[in-house]
Amino acid sequence: EPPTACREKQYLINSQCCSLCQPGQKLVSDCTEFTETECLPCGESEFLDTWNRETHCHQHRHCEPNQGLRVKKEGTAESDTVCTCKEGQHCTSKDCEACAQHRSCSPGFGVKQIATGVSDTICEPCPVGFFSNVSSAFEKCHPWTSCETKDLVVQQAGTNKTDVVCGPQDRLR
């Protein structure tokens, strides 16, 4: 009696179970009662990443430099090329189809997490006692200067964008 289901890594065709082609190979001809499934390796710049019965291999992805992309991992017969973004940019989607410039944290904000090839800069407001006076994709908030450790007093309060201004003790009123 012809099978209605096949084992793993097999497929049903013409009432019989044939072996699937292994990753990195494509199907040339189905098996018969007398012959095994015929498979051929994928060509250069092609791949198939699963056990399959595909008659054509997929083209390796092209990392388009004009879109800010570069190769992170070269493709093989069994895997696609992995793209990432050039320095100073990050992927805008999970598949890294395009890149965007890392955002900078504005004055009053510091970098909480530096951007990577796959994630943008994360900024956070500088709390009281800290400041950032620059727009930067790398700098954290800086602590206000401690005037007392320099035998000075605060002449002007700090803000989230400016450091305190220290002055001599003799300006006490």
Epitope: P125, V128, G129, E148, Q156
Partner: antibody, heavy 122, light 113 residues
Framework: QVQLQQSGAELMKPGASVKIPCKAT????????IEWVKQRPGHGLEWIGE????????NYNEKFKGKATFTADTSSNTAYMQLSSLTSEDSAVYYC???????????????WGQGTLVTVSA | DIVMSQSPSSLAVSVGEKVTMSCKSS????????????LAWYQQKPGQSPKLLIY???TRESGVPDRFTGSGSGTDFTLTISSVKAEDLAVYYC?????????FGGGTKLEIK
Amino acid sequence: QVQLQQSGAELMKPGASVKIPCKATGYTFSSYWIEWVKQRPGHGLEWIGEVLPGSGSTNYNEKFKGKATFTADTSSNTAYMQLSSLTSEDSAVYYCARPYYRYDVGAWFAYWGQGTLVTVSA
Amino acid sequence: DIVMSQSPSSLAVSVGEKVTMSCKSSQSLLYSGNQKNYLAWYQQKPGQSPKLLIYWASTRESGVPDRFTGSGSGTDFTLTISSVKAEDLAVYYCQQYYSYPYTFGGGTKLEIK
């Protein structure tokens, strides 16, 4: 120990000004912010601003700019808050307070005065 | 400005009961640079000045009974009184000191049944 002493109640006419003192003892007055807080019934607590007596440096809540003015006299260890052009909205208890740390950590208010009740009435 | 919201606005409990009250901020009060939450809790008994209970969201002020516990991080905070005493009748306020202007919650009034 740290103490902040405030004056008693003040009854003021609309349009007038009032200057509320806060006398500090038990610490180096010039080195710590003096905070000012307003409390109206049903309105909770509102931060008005702060003054650093050593330099006269100030931070104001935008809402109270033009209404409150802070000064400090280091010779008498007294901070002052002047409220101008008084209206019934200014009727409240006004507290002075002092943070635990000096000036660079953000302020939670560890020490409080007993409050000054200001009543504005014609 | 950072908006602080407290709930409930009032609650009545019996002596010995556990009570929790909530404080939420409109932006995170956790600074990654020092992993501290810039939040304090105060108790104000009738006719008195506010009194500091908790700072850095969970550090108990010296002399405050250990039945008072602060917890939470980011934007959600809780003050818990493990076993309420009659003397805990008060209004409880949270305050953020992350950024100017410092702001307080509207308060939670604790009444004793």
